[in-house]
Structure formats: structure tokens, C-alpha cells
Interface confidence: low
């Protein structure tokens, strides 16, 4: 079943290569198990950046080696991507799946364009 997911259109990553945005999904009831997937679209190619499953009574937990972190509150998920470089500029799409209880719902946002500007190297100091 279809579900609406909303996310900001544009986000500028910090000089340290960190970008955060909120992904909000429309839900008629309380889902016990929610899966959030971050996808990066470059041209016609779509790749998975990271994914996490969380529950209403638990914190959003990405794998230890993931480039993403996040927190959840109700039907909002605050996602943070780390280690971004200029080549990481692109459209990042938030996909939300309400896994449990039935029925299953899935929603995809329109994407957040993340702009990453690599910092200028510091000049050597004598």
C-alpha cells in the first residue's frame, strides 16, 4: 500500500561532510516496526546508502559501520549522513516501510538534494 513520505528539497552539508534532515511519513496508526532506507540517486542509478529497522519502543539503530545515524520520534525520523565529500553531492531519497503489524505500507520521499563542498586545504603555516 502507498504512503506519503516528506523530506526537505535541499540541504547543505557542513564543512565536516555531515548533513542532516528530517524524513516524515504519514501513518494512520502506530506501527510497531518501521524500516528506514536512505537511497542515493545519481542519474538513473539508485544505490542504498544505509538502512535501519526500529520499533516504537526502541531507538533507531544503524549498523556500527554505517555512514548514517538517526533518531526517531513518532512518525518523524531525523537522519544524519557522515563522511560526505564533494563527489557525494546528489539526491538522497528517504524510503519508509511500515513492517509490522499488517498491513504493510511503503512510502518514498521526493528526495533531498545534498550539496557537499569540500573545504579548502589549510595553507601551510611557517
Amino acid at each position: 500500500k502507498g504512503m506519503h513520505a516528506a523530506q526537505p528539497a535541499v540541504v547543505l552539508a557542513s564543512s565536516r561532510g555531515v548533513a542532516s534532515f528530517v524524513c516524515e511519513y504519514g501513518s494512520s496508526g502506530n506501527a510497531a516496526e518501521v524500516r528506514v532506507t536512505m537511497l542515493r540517486q545519481a542519474g538513473s542509478q539508485m544505490t542504498e546508502v544505509c538502512a535501519a529497522t526500529y520499533t516504537v519502543e526502541d531507538e533507531l539503530a544503524f549498523l556500527d559501520d554505517s555512514t548514517c545515524t538517526g533518531t526517531s520520534s513518532g512518525n518523524k525520523v531525523n537522519l544524519t549522513i557522515q563522511g560526505l565529500r564533494a563527489m557525494g553531492t546528489g539526491l538522497y531519497i528517504c524510503k519508509v516501510e511500515l513492517m509490522y503489524p499488517p498491513p504493510y505500507y511503503v512510502g518514498m520521499g521526493n528526495g533531498t538534494q545534498i550539496y557537499v563542498i569540500d573545504p579548502e586545504p589549510c595553507p601551510d603555516s611557517d
Epitope: 526502541d58 503489524p101 499488517p102 498491513p103 504493510y104
Partner: antibody, heavy 121, light 107 residues
Framework: QVQLQQPGTELVKPGASVKLSCKAS????????MHWVKQRPGQGLEWIGN????????RFNEKFKNKATLTEDKSSSTAYMQLSSLTSEDSAVYYC??????????????WGQGTLVTVSA | DIQMNQSPSSLSASLGDTITITCHAS??????LSWYQQKPGNIPKLLIY???NLHTGVPSRFSGSGSGTGFTLTISSLQPEDIATYYC?????????FGGGTKLEIK
């Protein structure tokens, strides 16, 4: 009240298949996932997989992916598990179990009586 | 898969005793652990969910605790009807896995 009815026993020959049933009553069948659990005689419990009765979606323990097929029939509120290419290792009690969403989606609050499958020539 | 190691595998205690069964997970499962009781010839019965929550109708002499990788089930004032095998089960990630069981006997 919630009830999960399973036939008591099934005697099958090695290499054959068997289809176990679990008839649910006392609740809305499509609102809760149904799980299947294996218990060999005198042994512990093993989770086989589950089915979402609202759309037929399944999840499996990899160990049972080529052994078990889970289906459902919404019209009769019945979940099915077919076991194929049976060997003596498949002789066990098979339970269907339902989670209790109100008290945690991963826990099995309701169990069928179990079907004893005996594989013997 | 997450491995669930239960100890002891068997336990003998006297009526009125307080006993503890432990369950160790091979990786962090937060509080997503449940305990079941299975009496001889019977079906498993849910006792505790989410580590410490008592399921409806379960006597208060049963209690659970723990988080992360270490969990305990405590039965205080042991009763004759507590003779059973007890299993822990993790609900953190698929496939759900059970401990090997602890068989409780009365001395």
C-alpha cells in the same frame, strides 16, 4: 478468545510432502502475523518463519527456506505450512503461533496445540 | 544469526527456593528478549516479554531483567507447578532464535 487449531498428527513417508494447517479464530486473521516453530522430540524450539496474512508476505529462517512454504487462506482464516522432501530430521512437533501486538510484536502469546509429524517408511 | 546461550541446562531446587536462569546473547539485543515456560507434554507459554514485562495472567513470582547481552529469569518461592523447561528468545533481528532451554526439577 483467540484460538489456533492444528491437527494432532501426520504420518508421512520419506521424500514425500505434507501440508500442515492452522485455523485461527477469535480475532481478525489479517491483523496479526502467523509464525511457525519446530520442536524435535526432547529438543528445543526453532523459529521457521512467518507470514503476513494480509498480503501473503513471508520471512524465513534461512535454514528452512528450501524446506517450508508458507501460505494462507483469508476466507477460512487458515495458515498453512508445506514441508517438502521429508526425512527423519523433519520428524517433530510443528506449532503455529501468533504474536500479541499489544505487548510486543516479537513475542508469541498464542500457540496452537502443535502437529506431530512422523516421517517413517 | 544471534546465538542465545542459556545456563544452566538443568536445575534442581527445593520448594520455596528462589532460582535464577541466565540467557546470554551473542550480540546486543537491547531489551528484545522473552521467556517461555513449557511443561512436559504441553505447549510453550509466554511468561515475560521485552526483558522484564510480565505477560497477562503470569504469577508475580516470575520476574525478568537485563539488557544488551545478559538476561535473567528469576522464580521466587518455587511452587510444584513450576516444574518445566524454560526458554529464552530474542526478538531483535531475524531469524528469531531461542535458547537451548533450562529444565527445572524439584528436589
Amino acid at each position: 478468545q483467540v484460538q489456533l487449531q492444528q491437527p494432532g498428527t501426520e504420518l508421512v513417508k520419506p521424500g514425500a510432502s505434507v501440508k500442515l494447517s492452522c485455523k485461527a479464530s477469535g480475532y481478525t486473521f489479517t491483523s496479526y502475523w502467523m509464525h511457525w516453530v519446530k520442536q524435535r522430540p526432547g529438543q528445543g524450539l526453532e523459529w521457521i518463519g512467518n507470514i503476513n496474512p494480509s498480503n501473503g508476505g513471508t520471512r524465513f529462517n534461512e535454514k528452512f527456506k528450501n524446506k517450508a512454504t508458507l501460505t494462507e487462506d483469508k476466507s477460512s482464516s487458515t495458515a498453512y505450512m508445506q514441508l517438502s522432501s521429508l526425512t527423519s530430521e523433519d520428524s517433530a512437533v510443528y506449532y503455529c503461533a501468533r504474536s500479541n501486538y499489544g505487548s510486543g510484536w516479537a513475542w508469541f502469546a498464542y500457540w496452537g496445540q502443535g502437529t506431530l509429524v512422523t516421517v517413517s517408511a | 544469526d544471534i546465538q542465545m546461550n542459556q545456563s544452566p541446562s538443568s536445575l534442581s531446587a527445593s520448594l520455596g527456593d528462589t532460582i535464577t536462569i541466565t540467557c546470554h546473547a551473542s550480540q546486543n539485543i537491547n531489551v528484545w528478549l522473552s521467556w517461555y515456560q513449557q511443561k512436559p507434554g504441553n505447549i510453550p507459554k509466554l511468561l515475560i516479554y521485552k526483558s522484564s514485562n510480565l505477560h497477562t495472567g503470569v504469577p508475580s513470582r516470575f520476574s525478568g531483567s537485563g539488557s544488551g547481552t545478559g538476561f535473567t529469569l528469576t522464580i521466587s518461592s518455587l511452587q510444584p507447578e513450576d516444574i518445566a523447561t524454560y526458554y529464552c528468545q530474542q526478538g531483535q533481528s531475524y531469524p528469531w532464535t531461542f535458547g537451548g532451554g533450562t529444565k527445572l526439577e524439584i528436589k
